[in-house]
């Protein structure tokens, strides 16, 4: 593959570049729909950053569904997005970084962050809770990682992104785990706990991928995400089995998930603590 021989291109398994999606639907989870047909289709997986096969039921579902691998790649990958971009090239910011701050029309007055193209910095603003635009981040770190330039004019994040149901913005979620481990379970096991915005206090469990355990949290009764289980057993069954230990570049073995304490990028902790 001639692309791999290009000067300054670094291929790495453990650190991925910021994911800049060409279409927001590329961030949707594979949705087989309610029907029962067995049709081979392809979807873009935001966590592996590759187009992958899935079985489609034949009706409904979403736009992250393609007849062929080629079509999927064409719609959702930009110059092999799973590679670290050449260090000689500056990565483009997503278009939404250049939108003005937009509080929307609601009055929730939630603290959010936006990229100010005048000052070239991420700044705090008050978001109302509805409408607005995609230049809207839950943390300063997220905003910086997506929209600010690093010291050399490069963008510096190591985040994947996923579509956030809050305001449909592409919101980064750190999916890094210590490099000895790879996650092969459902992608939502890597998302932070999200209690939603209703007023109930239901006991639920979510998978904390930083510590590798299922933990309780209070669910509000609506909204949130799929990292939400009614029992610890269900949570463990869905998420715990997903960790695989890499023993060499070529081979993978399943492992019991006992780990030494390791330093993990703090931004992830901040995201899930904020949502608890």
């Amino acid at each position: 593959d001639s692309e791999e021989d290009e000067e300054h291109t670094i291929i790495t398994d453990t650190e991925l570049p910021p994911l800049k999606l060409m279409h927001s639907f590329c961030a949707f989870k594979a949705d087989d729909g309610p029907c029962k047909a067995i049709m081979k289709r392809f979807f873009f997986n935001i966590f592996t950053r590759q187009c992958e096969e899935f079985i489609y039921g034949g009706c409904e579902g979403n736009q992250n569904r393609f007849e062929s691998l080629e079509e999927c790649k064409k719609m959702c990958t930009r110059d092999n997005a799973n590679r670290i971009i050449k260090t000689t090239l500056q990565q483009e910011k997503p278009d939404f970084c250049f939108l003005e701050e937009d509080p929307g029309i609601c009055r929730g007055y939630i603290t959010r962050y936006f990229y100010n193209n005048q000052t070239k910095q991420c700044e705090r603003f008050k978001y109302g809770g509805c409408l607005g635009n995609m230049n809207n981040f839950e943390t300063l770190e997220e905003c910086k990682n997506i929209c600010e330039d690093g010291p050399n004019g490069f963008q510096v994040d190591n985040y994947g992104t996923q579509l956030n149901a809050v305001n449909n913005s592409l919101t980064p979620q750190s999916t890094k785990v210590p490099s000895l481990f790879e996650f092969h379970g459902p992608s939502w096991c890597l998302t932070p706990a999200d209690r939603g915005l209703c007023r109930a206090n239901e006991n639920r469990f979510y998978y904390n991928s930083v510590i590798g355990k299922c933990r309780p949290f209070k669910y509000s009764g609506c909204g949130g995400n799929e990292n939400n289980f009614t029992s610890k057993q269900e949570c463990l069954r869905a998420c715990k089995k997903g960790f695989i230990q890499r023993i060499s570049k070529g081979g993978l073995i399943k492992t019991k998930r006992k780990r030494k304490k390791q330093r993990v990028k703090i931004a992830y902790e901040e995201i899930f603590v904020k949502n608890m």
């Epitope: 609601c106 009055r107 939630i110 809770g129 509805c130 305001n167 449909n168 209703c198 609506c222």
Partner: antibody, heavy 124, light 107 residues
């Protein structure tokens, strides 16, 4: 009790301008917890949001792409009302037009109040 | 634009039946989802706002639930006055969009 009262002609000629007014009682057009909207309904199109205005330290508006080049929604603070102007109408614009309040007094928004509706027919 | 797809488009039911209408958004929305009832010649009437909150004065047989892309309006025991057209609405993303409606008819 908040009410919206619509007024305006029911018949407009093609290529002319459709003008409707919505008078608000019991709330203020300058409220910072509402947006004021126009919505229309026709058998072919169902319910279609046309646009809205809202005041948040300054006046803002948002319009549906389908009518953006032809629509103006204006507030009239002295009369506590807002108006719809739709230029260059065609028979396709024949519909029941509703003014409505979008309640935005919290984390989520919803239309909680509607005018009585005005059937506007575009015909020569 | 977010497309709101309601199903079924019409249904026949009897007084006392439990009726469920679903609304599927083409992409995830947050909590700005509401439900309306419309009778011939009248403006729509708000039933449920913020996914699951009952509007003041609306009978408790109406309830709403859901999250993400899938939302449901349930009438626990259909009454004669409930025969009408029902719409969902999202005010989470511009443009504001409605479902195409579900007509509830007498069996």
């Amino acid at each position: 009790q908040v009410q919206l009262q619509q007024s305006g002609p029911g018949l407009v000629k093609p290529s002319q301008t459709l003008s409707l007014t919505c008078a608000i009682s019991g709330d203020s057009v300058s409220s910072n917890s509402a947006a004021w909207s126009w919505i229309r309904q026709s058998p072919g199109r169902g319910l279609e949001w046309l646009g809205m205005i809202f005041y948040r330290s300054k006046w803002n508006n948002d319009y549906a792409v389908s009518v953006k080049s032809r629509i103006t929604i204006n507030p009239d603070t002295s009369k506590n009302q807002f108006s719809l102007q739709l230029n260059s109408v065609t028979p396709e614009d024949t519909a029941v037009y509703y003014c409505a309040r979008v309640n935005a007094n919290g984390y989520y928004a919803y239309v909680d109040l509607w005018g009585q509706g005005t059937l506007v027919t575009v015909s020569s | 634009d977010i497309q709101m797809t309601q199903s079924p488009s019409s249904l026949s039911a009897s007084v006392g039946d439990r009726v469920t209408i679903t609304c599927r958004a083409s992409q995830p929305i947050y909590n700005s989802l509401s439900w309306y009832q419309q009778k011939p010649g009248k403006a729509p009437k708000l039933l449920i706002y913020g996914v699951s909150n009952l509007q003041s004065g609306v009978p408790s047989r109406f309830s709403g639930s859901g999250s993400g892309t899938d939302f449901t309006l349930t009438i626990s025991s259909l009454q004669p006055e409930d025969f009408a057209v029902y719409y969902c609405l999202q005010v989470d993303n511009l443009p504001i969009t409605f479902g195409q409606g579900t007509k509830v008819e007498i069996k």
